[in-house]
């Protein structure tokens, strides 16, 4: 019969701006891989079917709902020749290949904030105006897709640093919007970092820090 | 079906305590913010705040802050409007809803409201 | 806190006729990330619940027919209904979903003549 295929384990999604995949171990010897995934209250789709990869993308599918919480296994399938050369899923006696269980994943509550952009600042005597990209997301609404603002509105807020090239304290603000207003000392260059921020999260609330933008740097000026 | 479905009427004294609740069918509770709004008696709507399932994260309209309280249990995945300290002003018709899939898109369900009386 | 003003305070129509409301926030509702207009329209009948007509100002809610039309953009706001029928004859909202707190404006109550 063979020895029985192992079983996946360290399965992890991995996402950001809901571009997901879900990852696993080991790399697989004498057998492949399948996944499935379904809602709560769906059927198991499959995925990735007899795949050698430790990993499969699934953000075709959570994109369709992202506030769905989504489950996931990996299957372990022998080789398994049929008469049509193609492994099969199930034994000769149809029993289901061993298989592991993903953690649950809700896209909305969970996908990580990808580091955001400065996409302008402009000076106005002793006002800055610092606006971030709107970035976009492979979520869909009739065939466009949305921007992270579009999918979680109010839910979303940005918080920046910003300091005095010449020294290191920073002074923070923030925004519902993707603008933020701040007095800055007149005759002052300033640097920037924002961040994406969801502060009713309880996991992954805040993404990476944006590259730093300074005032006064040649491709900078004022809009870039 | 998305459904939301509210406690009874109640007639209460002023000075006591009202819990109503709202239970929601028919999607995923913890990733939805519920909002409560208030409509007087021949009067407009005003919203009171909202409660997000999954962290218990809540807004209040400064008006109801400190006698509503927002809560919600994801085991029966409902929500909860507790409002204390009762007084005439507070006759109404409470309603629940559900915020709309996409980002600041409105409130897309609602209860069928709970009448909340309050009478010496 | 952003205040919303509908105008008018009550209206009266004939069936077919086109009706057209206004609804002015005390501050831009446009996103500038995303360029929406965060603003809200809804229907409420008596002893019913409100039911939602349009999002981001002039998107249709699924099943909303397609007499009712939302337009505006910053400040300035319109629903219209361009054919009236007998079943639209209710106290119609705007709201501001822009920013905490939300705000509703006072209604317009929409009559048959």
């Known amino acids: 019969a063979g020895t029985p295929p192992g079983k996946a384990f360290n399965l992890t999604w991995i996402s950001a701006d809901f571009k997901t995949i879900l990852a696993w171990q080991p790399k697989p010897t004498n057998y492949t891989y399948t996944v499935q995934i379904s809602t709560k209250s769906g059927d198991w789709k499959y995925k990735c079917t007899g795949t050698t990869d430790t990993e499969c993308a699934l953000t075709d599918e959570i994109v369709k709902d992202v506030k769905q919480t989504y489950l996931a296994r990996v299957l372990s399938v022998p080789w398994r020749n049929s008469t049509h050369g193609k492994e099969t899923l199930f034994g000769t006696h149809g029993e289901e290949p061993p298989f592991t269980n993903a953690p649950e994943f809700t896209p909305y509550l969970e996908t990580n904030l990808g580091a955001p952009t400065i996409q302008s600042f402009e000076q106005v005597g002793t006002k800055v105006n610092v606006t971030v990209e709107d970035e976009r997301t492979l979520v869909r609404r009739n065939n466009t897709f949305l921007s992270l603002r579009d999918v979680f509105g109010k839910d979303l807020i940005y918080t920046l640093a910003y300091w005095k090239s010449s020294s290191s304290g920073a002074k923070t603000a923030a925004t519902n919007t993707n603008e933020f207003l701040i007095d800055v000392d007149k005759g002052e260059n300033y640097c920037f970092s924002v961040q994406a921020v969801i502060p009713s999260r309880t996991v992954n609330r805040a993404s990476t820090d944006s590259p730093v933008e300074c005032m006064g740097q040649e491709h900078h000026h004022h809009h870039h | 079906e998305v459904q939301l479905v509210q406690s009874g009427s109640e007639l209460k004294k002023p000075g006591a305590s009202v819990k109503v609740s709202c239970k929601a069918s028919g999607y995923t509770f913890i990733t939805y913010w519920i909002e409560w709004v208030k409509q007087r008696p021949g009067q407009g709507l005003e919203w009171m705040g909202d409660i997000l399932p999954y962290s218990g994260s809540t807004n209040y309209n400064e008006n109801f802050k400190g006698r509503a309280t927002f809560s919600a249990d994801t085991s029966v995945s409902t929500a909860y409007l507790q409002i204390s300290s009762l007084k005439a002003e507070d006759t109404a018709v409470y309603y629940c809803?559900?915020?709309?899939?996409?980002?600041?898109?409105?409130?897309?369900?609602w209860g069928q409201g709970t009448l909340v009386t309050v009478s010496s | 806190d952003i205040q919303m003003t509908q105008s008018p305070s009550s209206l009266s129509a004939s069936v077919g006729d086109r009706v057209t409301i206004t609804c002015q926030s005390s501050q831009s509702l446009l996103s500038s990330g995303n360029q929406k207009n965060y603003l809200t329209w809804y229907q409420q009948k008596p002893g019913k619940a409100p039911k939602l007509l349009i999002y981001?100002?002039?998107t249709r809610e699924s099943g909303v027919p397609s007499r009712f039309s939302g337009s505006g953009s910053g400040t300035d706001f319109t629903l219209t209904i361009s054919s009236l029928q007998p079943e639209d004859f209710a106290t119609y909202y705007c709201q501001n979903d822009y920013t905490y707190p939300l705000t509703f404006g006072q209604g317009t109550k929409l009559e048959i003549k």
């Open positions: 809803a559900r915020s709309g899939y996409y980002g600041n898109s409105g409130f897309a369900y």
């Open positions: 981001w100002a002039s």
